[in-house]
């Protein structure tokens, strides 16, 4: 199946060309400046002639030019201005924005304990799954089971934190090799990204805001797979990463540090830890084969416990099986000897709504799901909703130029490096890379944030997750300490390989390109972007799971085809671009195969009928269900209270976006309500700080 | 306190049988096994068995095993031994005894009955 | 079965005076021994458990030693209420065994 369909007869357009290698970082799209594209992965493009005719760019633009969709959207402010105001009404505009501010922090704050509670309910639904996954002998020896199941695991249970912590252990009692480890972290890496992508589909209400949020999420997930795609086969041809952490943990006398600095779960512990409390220990002790563990509840009950090692007393068959004569004995019924034990006694009970409820870990993972997914999902919308009515006008200039403005000439190209820093240091501060990347996700949906700054501080954050494991390896007890550290050293400079192969040359930056073009795709077939994450972060590592499974032969006798098939494709798609005279008339386009196999409309169509029953009965009740339900089914038909399905003419013209090759993108006209230009409700209530 | 009161003295015939009690109280009758002992000038104190009120299990020294029947009444919390098939050997003073809590030894003992086989 | 041999029936000693009874076992027995005490015409009170601990209510001037198969019962300072016999008992396997006794009297 081709994979860029529709792109049989494309012109290239002679207005666009290609910016320098500088990578100047987009601001507010000017009119008078539109041509002048800021992308650095821009390429010929096919313009779109047609207008649609409730759009009013026709009495304004040139019917021939269209706005570049990821530009950011103007967010204009139709309040009255700061100066224009009396007393009274500077008082009152001061109180809005403190009010603004408190409530932004508090559904920020809800936002993140949502993430967090959303972590303990993958691993209730799944987490045993996951430690019984480790528990393959085959990852020794096959590093791709090694990798999907660092994948899966993660995805499982929603933190890659866990995942190595349960690899740690595991090779810390010899029941892994560090080699065998490294592609487990690989896969770890990966599998942490699908949380902002997951936070990118709360924002499919708005078809411009979900298409800069979901491109903004999976740069995320495209960076890591294209990095294990190039280097966990170097890594197995070579063992590069497993020599240099080896050299370096051999190289130091570490001594035992202390841990690393708990800042943002200190303010959100004490909030989630009222709702669920889980024991961890329970999922690496399944990995290390516990059979015991395996009928153990992750809920924690007991928070408060005494252990204490003592001698008890038994009763033996005879005295026989006494261990000496000294420690045994007769009430004048039984024989009873002493016996070194663990005792523990429980003295508190936790303090959590789940504690005394005693419900399988199942149905308590399934509640914590809904309920974190909704209130993820509410915290942010009314976060988009206030930031929105806040950065309007000058504050949004200001704050867009500042974040995405860079360094004067001959430093632009410091600033990427600048934000690599930055995203590693508020990932440290925040102690978890899917909390910073999730933070990010609405801000790129709003237009706060360019795709093209938004991927270096999601780089710096893939650093400061692993600058987090390496001070928590440091303060590991001795026996883990070496395996921990190599661990956290392996996944630090997976990280760093990554950043070199695809930062460095604004050429190589592929994962912008193919997370725009994603981008695309999804905004217009928006079940696609659920379509992708299922594919892309179960099917396709389960598939090779259980290929795996089957046995070398198996896994390269499917493999070899499909990657065979893939990279024809790629070649024939690149030929297609660069050269189209090499190849013969037929090839030059994929006109040659069904349109199912080239173009997505068929699928929308059976999507679409797959859904038809939920389009006539939308939940018109609240924003979050039609959010739902738009994801579901682009639900043209209803749900007018929400702006999901006000572009109902968009949907029903059925513009095509074509899957385009990754240096290419779409032009779509786009409403001004898209753009983000929705005129305030009222201007009364409406005041900006500048 | 911890009491353990034994039934009267008992003078019976050679070949009959005597059943004599240990009410105990002060204490969970269940949790501690209750021993029995025999006491004669001659042969000094003679542990005959055990019982443990809570499940019923007894145990009994070989020489004892055809003589003596241990039971109890948990609802009164009240041990029993029967005697059969008394001789003259069996004249002695018999002793009942709380035993320590999973230990062999005797922490309370009862004030003794004494039993005396004559015809 | 285990033998308990309490080698002295009698013993004499003045009040203020220590003793020391002494019990052997012909097996180990580790621990597992008791002290008892009986009056003339009483029932007999257990004074030591585990060879060395002493039951609640009983005077610190009783003290038992020993193990695996020698053992001892010593009183200091013999009160006029300490006149009594005193047996040794071993619990370390069944039957439960006692020794013969000995018979503590003035001098």
């Known amino acids: 199946m081709a994979p860029w369909p529709e792109l049989g007869d494309a012109q290239p357009n002679p207005d666009k060309y290609l910016e320098g290698a500088a990578g100047q970082q987009p601001t507010a799209p000017d009119k008078s400046k539109e041509t002048n594209k800021t992308d650095n992965t821009e390429a010929p493009v096919t313009k779109i002639e047609l207008l649609p005719s409730y759009s009013t760019a026709t009495l304004i633009d040139e019917p021939t030019e269209v706005d570049d969709p990821w530009n950011l959207p103007t967010l204009q402010d139709s309040g009255i201005k700061w100066s224009e105001r009396d007393t009274k009404g500077k008082i009152l505009c001061f109180f809005q924005g403190i009010g603004r501010l408190i409530l932004l922090l508090g559904f920020l704050y809800f936002f993140v304990c949502s993430l967090d509670i959303l972590s303990s309910a993958f691993q209730l639904v799944g987490g045993k799954m996951a430690g019984q996954f480790f528990s393959n002998s085959s990852i020794m020896s096959n590093p791709l089971l090694g990798l999907v199941i660092g994948v899966l695991v993660t995805v499982l249970v929603q933190s890659s934190s866990t995942s190595t912590s349960i690899v740690v252990s595991m090779v810390s009692s010899s029941l892994l090799t560090v080699r065998a480890a490294i592609p487990i972290i690989m896969g770890a890496n990966i599998g942490t990204s699908i949380t902002n992508t997951i936070v990118a589909l709360m924002q499919v209400g708005d078809r411009s805001e979900f298409r800069r949020a979901f491109a903004g999420a999976t740069v995320h997930d495209f960076f890591n797979w294209l990095s294990v795609l190039v280097l966990l086969p170097v890594e197995v041809a070579t063992h590069y990463l497993e020599i240099i952490t080896q050299l370096i943990v051999e190289s130091f006398h570490f001594k035992n540090g202390e841990d690393a600095p708990d800042l943002l779960k200190v303010i959100t512990k004490p909030f989630t830890k009222l709702i669920v409390q889980l024991d961890k220990k329970v999922i690496s002790q399944i990995a290390m084969n516990d059979e015991k563990a395996k009928n153990k509840s992750l809920v924690k009950i007991w928070c408060k416990t005494f252990t204490n090692k003592t001698q008890i007393n038994v009763t033996v068959p005879s005295t026989a099986n006494c261990t000496s004569p000294s420690l045994c004995w007769t009430d004048g019924i039984q024989n009873w000897t002493m016996k070194n034990v663990t005792y523990k006694e429980n003295i508190a009970k936790c303090q959590h709504i789940f504690v005394n409820f005693h419900l399988p870990d199942l149905a308590v993972g399934t509640i914590l799901l809904i309920l974190s997914l909704l209130v993820l999902c509410g915290c942010l919308i009314m976060i988009v909703k206030i930031l929105g009515s806040v950065l309007k006008g000058q504050v949004a200039t200001v704050i867009k130029k500042t974040i995405n403005t860079d360094f004067p000439f001959p430093f632009a190209w410091l600033t990427g490096y600048l934000a690599i820093l930055v995203g590693a240091g508020m990932t440290f501060i925040v102690q978890s890379s899917s909390v910073f990347t999730s933070a990010l996700t609405p801000l790129i949906g709003i237009g706060v944030i360019t795709i093209e700054r938004a991927y270096p501080l999601t780089l710096g954050s893939n650093i400061g997750t692993t600058t987090t494991a390496i001070l928590a390896a440091l303060a590991s007890p001795g026996n883990a300490l070496r395996s921990s550290l190599q661990i956290a050293l392996c996944h630090f400079f997976f990280n760093i390989s990554g950043i070199l192969l695809w930062y460095p040359i604004p050429f190589t930056r592929l994962p912008i390109r193919m997370a725009k073009g994603l981008g695309n795709i999804s905004a217009k077939y928006r079940w696609f972007a659920v379509f992708y994450l299922i594919i892309f972060f179960f099917l396709i590592p389960l598939t090779v799971f259980g290929l795996s499974l089957a046995g070398w032969r198996v896994l390269v006798g499917v493999g070899v085809p499909v990657v065979f098939i893939i990279i024809l494709v790629l070649c024939l798609r690149l030929l297609q671009s660069r050269c189209p005279r090499v190849l013969p008339k037929k090839l030059q386009n994929w006109n040659f195969l069904p349109l199912w196999m080239r173009s997505l409309k068929p699928w929308d169509a059976v999507v679409s009928k797959f859904t038809g029953c939920f389009q006539m009965r939308c939940c018109c009740c609240c924003r979050v269900c039609c959010r739902a339900c738009c994801l579901l089914c682009d639900c043209p038909k209803c749900c007018r209270c929400s702006k999901c399905c006000e572009d109902l003419e968009e949907a029903q013209e059925g513009q095509d976006v074509p899957v385009k090759a990754p240096e290419t993108f779409d032009n779509i006209t786009i409403s001004r309500e898209a753009q983000g230009e929705v005129p305030a409700s009222d201007s009364k209530t409406e005041c900006t700080a500048l | 306190q911890i009491q353990l009161v034994q039934s009267g003295a008992e003078l019976v015939r050679p070949g009959a049988s005597v059943k004599m009690s240990c009410k105990t109280s002060?204490?969970?009758?269940?949790?501690?096994?209750v021993h029995w002992v025999k006491q004669t000038p001659r042969q000094g104190l003679e542990w005959i068995g055990a019982?443990?009120?809570?499940?019923?299990?007894?145990s009994y020294t070989q020489k004892f095993k055809a003589k003596a029947t241990l039971t109890v009444d948990k609802s009164s919390s009240t041990a029993y031994m029967q005697l059969s098939s008394l001789t003259s050997e069996d004249s002695a003073v018999y002793f009942c005894?709380?035993?320590?809590?999973?230990?062999?030894?005797?922490?309370?003992w009862g004030q003794g009955t004494s039993v005396t086989v004559s015809s | 079965d285990i033998v308990m041999t309490q080698s002295h029936k009698f013993m004499s000693t003045s009040v203020g005076d220590r003793v020391s009874v002494t019990c052997k076992a012909s097996?180990?027995?580790?621990?597992?021994v008791a002290w008892y005490q009986q009056r003339p015409g009483q029932s007999p009170k257990e004074l030591i458990y585990?060879?060395?601990n002493r039951f609640t209510g009983v005077p610190d001037r009783f003290t038992g030693s020993g193990s695996g198969t020698d053992f001892t019962l010593t009183i200091t300072n013999v009160q006029s209420e300490d006149l009594a016999d005193y047996f040794c008992q071993q619990y370390s396997s069944p039957p439960l065994t006692f020794g013969a006794g000995t018979k503590l009297e003035l001098k």
């Open positions: 005894a709380r035993g320590g809590f999973r230990l062999g030894s005797m922490d309370y």
């Open positions: 585990w060879a060395s």
């Open positions: 019982i443990s009120p809570g499940n019923g299990l007894t």
């Open positions: 097996q180990n027995v580790g621990t597992s």
């Open positions: 002060g204490y969970t009758f269940t949790t501690y096994n």
